[in-house]
Amino acid sequence: LVPHLGDREKRDSVCPQGKYIHPQNNSICCTKCHKGTYLYNDCPGPGQDTDCRECESGSFTASENHLRHCLSCSKCRKEMGQVEISSCTVDRDTVCGCRKNQYRHYWSENLFQCFNCSLCLNGTVHLSCQEKQNTVCTCHAGFFLRENECVSCSNCKKSLECTKLCLPQIENVKGTEDSGTT
C-alpha cells in the first residue's frame, strides 16, 4: 500500500527541492523562504522572487519554509523547574533545560520537569546522573531502594517488595539473638 501524501507534501513534491508549488497556479514553482523568515507573498511568476519577511521578535522559523506566519517562541516552564539554556532567535526556538545536578523527567513527549539528582545516601552511585535520567543507586547492607532512595530495612513492611532484599539482614539479627541465648 502506498501511503497517502498530505496536500502540502503533494504540492511540494511536484517542485524541485527548496521550492514549493504556487497555491493559485500549479505551473509555477516558488523559492521557499530561508529559516528566520516567513512567506509574505508568493512569487508572482517563474524565476521571480518570493516575498519573504524576517520573523518579528518573539517568533521564529527553524528551517526553510513557506509558512504564512512565524512560530511563537516557547517559554520555559518555571512551575516545572525549567531554566532557559538559550533564548529564542529568529531562526531557533528557546532551549529549556535544568540546573546543574538536576535531570529531566518527561511526563509526556513535550513536557519535562526538573528534579534533583539522587545523592545515594546510605548507598553508592551505580550510574551517574544524566540529562534525562536520575542517578542509579546501589544500597548498603541493611538498606533497600525505595523511589531511588536508600531506606533502612527497619522501615520494611512484610507486604512490600523489600522483604526479599532485607531478609538476610532480618535473619542475621535473629541469628545473633539466638546465639546469645544458650
Partner: nanobody
Amino acid sequence: EVQLLESGGGMVQPGGSLRLSCAAPGFTFEHEGMVWVRQAPGKGLEWVSHIGEDGQSTYYADSVKGRFTISRDNSKNTLYLQMNSLRAEDTAVYYCASIPKAGPSFDYWGQGTLVTVSS
C-alpha cells in the same frame, strides 16, 4: 492526612461538556502547582493539564488543547477542569494531584472521578 476529592464526572454524549472539581481541604493549596491526570481503560496515566500556584502558568496536552480549561480558586482550595467538545477518547478516570516536588511520583492525589463519553 491530605485528601483530594474529585467530583463532577459522569456519562455524557460526544460533543458534550462536564466540569470537574477537586477540593483540597487541609492542604496548603495556594503553595502548590496542581495537575489533572487521567487513566483510560487499560492504559497508563496521561498528564492532561496543570496550573502553577500563581494560576497564570498553564499547560495542556495536545489531545485536549482548545477543548479543556484548567482553573483554580485559592480562596476555596479548589481546582477545576472545564471539559468541552468531549470525545470518546476522553473516557477515563480523572485524578487531581499536586505537582511533585521531590521526585517523579505523586505525593498527594485523589480517588478519581469517572468520565464516560458515549452515544
